[in-house]
């Protein structure tokens, strides 16, 4: 039961995380105009990975895509790449994990195959989450650097009479969405990896244990439980299941309803 819960929860958390990574990647508010300690402008600027936007006090919003590829900063290209890799890995991970879920049956798939798939998807989610966190962090670092650079020479102009106020940018909502989403995907991946350990079938499955009485040779076949003699390497009491039988874990499904906002 715990294994299914962990696997199901890991899947749901990762699903929310990947949806968040996709949302963050598409969002326009990666950087927003810094309004603190600045003259109040009737124009609000914000930028995303794919386009920059301007919202006027009139209510009119104009967005312009970055139609150049070569003219863009290398850091922005790197962030785009990290986010896309994160989305692709996450999407593949989701696909793999759907088939790995214990509550879903596909033919006569072995537990070992499900365990491997769960581990694979878990690793994919971890890498996906790390890619998103790295991408957002690189962009945040770029913003911080530019912020202090523009603060250093905030007022530029001729003779001090005519001034041009340089627009400074600060963290946009997308960064926080990206960090949280990346973290959720990472947590979901870890949960999948933990679930994988519980899914892996036992290496030894003793069907019978012999007890040797003095002078007599009597064999006992306890139905399903291995008697512990205290000798040898098999000192733990373990529940043993016949090959074809299903555990409670395998029968129980884990229905949940999550709405991504």
């Amino acid at each position: 039961m715990a294994v299914t819960a962990c696997q199901g929860l890991g899947f749901v958390v990762s699903l929310i995380g990947i949806a968040g990574i996709i949302a963050a990647t598409c969002m326009d508010q990666w950087s927003t105009q810094d309004l603190y300690n600045n003259p109040v402008t009737a124009v609000f600027n914000y930028q995303g990975l794919w386009r920059s936007c301007v919202r006027e006090s009139s209510g009119f919003t104009e967005c312009r895509g970055y139609f150049t590829l070569l003219g863009l900063p290398a850091m922005l290209q790197a962030v785009r790449a990290l986010m896309i890799v994160g989305i692709v890995l996450g999407a593949i991970g989701l696909l793999v994990s759907i088939f790995a879920l214990k509550c879903i049956r596909i033919g006569s798939m072995e537990d070992s195959a499900k365990a491997n798939m769960t581990l694979t998807s878990g690793i994919m989610f971890i890498v996906s989450g790390l890619c998103a966190i790295a991408g957002v962090s690189v962009f945040a670092n770029m913003l911080v650097t530019n912020f202090w650079m523009s603060t250093a020479n905030m007022y530029t102009g001729m003779g001090g009479m005519v001034q041009t106020v340089q627009t400074r940018y600060t963290f946009g909502a997308a960064l926080f969405v990206g960090w949280v989403a990346g973290g959720l995907t990472l947590i979901g991946g870890v949960m999948m990896c933990i679930a994988c350990r519980g899914l892996a079938p036992e290496e030894t499955n003793y069907k019978a244990v012999s007890y040797h009485a003095s002078g007599h040779s009597v064999a006992y076949k306890p139905g399903g439980f291995k008697a512990s003699t205290g000798f040898g390497s098999n000192t733990k009491n373990k529940k043993i299941y016949d090959g074809g039988a299903r555990t409670e874990d395998e029968v129980q499904s884990y229905p949940s309803k999550h709405d991504y906002v």
């Epitope: 109040v40 402008t41 009737a42 124009v43 600027n45 006027e56 209510g59 005519v162 041009t164 106020v165």
Partner: antibody, heavy 118, light 113 residues
């Protein structure tokens, strides 16, 4: 046809209060930000206040901040300007105007005259 | 506050003449985000409210005759009337639409001989 009609002119004593209203028609009022602008007897134009389409963003000129309150009723297609602690320098022709692209003011009312005098 | 300075304060011209009105702002009105200048020109005929002529420094409002042309960037702006007509008798105002509080220039009074 876009129409903005301000309430009638008035004579108010210094320190007094008055509420101006501007009835809008011919366009979807709730989609547009609105502004009040005044013109002094010397014919100088002074921007007074701004309110966003939903009424959530409001800005005032420093000269009226703390004394004037801009508001809107989108259900009634009406813009308001509550003026308190009126001074003689508030004497002007008050126009309500619709905010357009580039934050320009594309439609103006005919204006209402406010005279603050003892 | 942004100071808008218009020159000349008044101008007398003959019909058909080309007129150049100037407007200077104390700070740049150019927004880096969209490379647009937030400056507007208005025309106010006697006894009427102001009428929008040009926004974004150079975009002509629909219905405005093409003899009116706005230009300039940053802090220096110009309104050109290529061939003045009798109906152009008015006061022309420029406005800063970029910084709050929005501020108007003192106006240029155009008179026809």
């Amino acid at each position: 046809d876009v129409k903005l009609v301000e309430s009638g002119e008035d004579l108010v004593k210094p320190g007094g209060s008055l509420k101006l209203s501007c009835a809008a028609s011919g366009f979807t009022f709730s989609n547009y930000a609105m502004s009040w602008v005044r013109q002094t007897p010397e014919k100088r134009l002074e921007w007074v206040a701004y309110v966003s389409s939903g009424g959530d963003y409001i800005y005032y000129a420093d000269t009226v901040k703390g004394r004037f309150i801009i508001s809107r009723d989108n259900a009634r297609n009406t813009l308001y300007l509550q003026m308190n602690s009126l001074r003689s320098e508030d004497t002007a022709m008050y126009y309500c105007a619709r905010v357009y692209f580039g934050n320009s003011l594309d439609y103006w009312g005919q204006g209402t005259t406010l005279t603050v005098s003892s | 506050d942004i100071v808008m300075t218009q020159s000349p304060s008044s101008l007398t011209v003959t019909a058909g003449e080309k007129v150049t009105l100037s407007c200077k702002s104390s700070q740049s009105l150019l927004n880096g985000g969209n490379q647009k200048n937030y400056l507007t020109w208005y025309q106010q005929r006697p006894g009427q409210p102001p009428k929008l002529l040009i926004y974004w420094a150079s975009t002509r409002e629909s219905g405005v005759p093409d003899r009116f042309t706005g230009s300039g960037s940053g802090t220096d702006f110009t309104l050109i009337i290529s061939s003045v007509q009798a109906e152009d008798l008015a006061v022309y105002y420029c406005q800063n639409d970029y910084y709050y509080p929005w501020t108007f220039g003192g106006g240029t009074k155009l008179e026809i001989k």
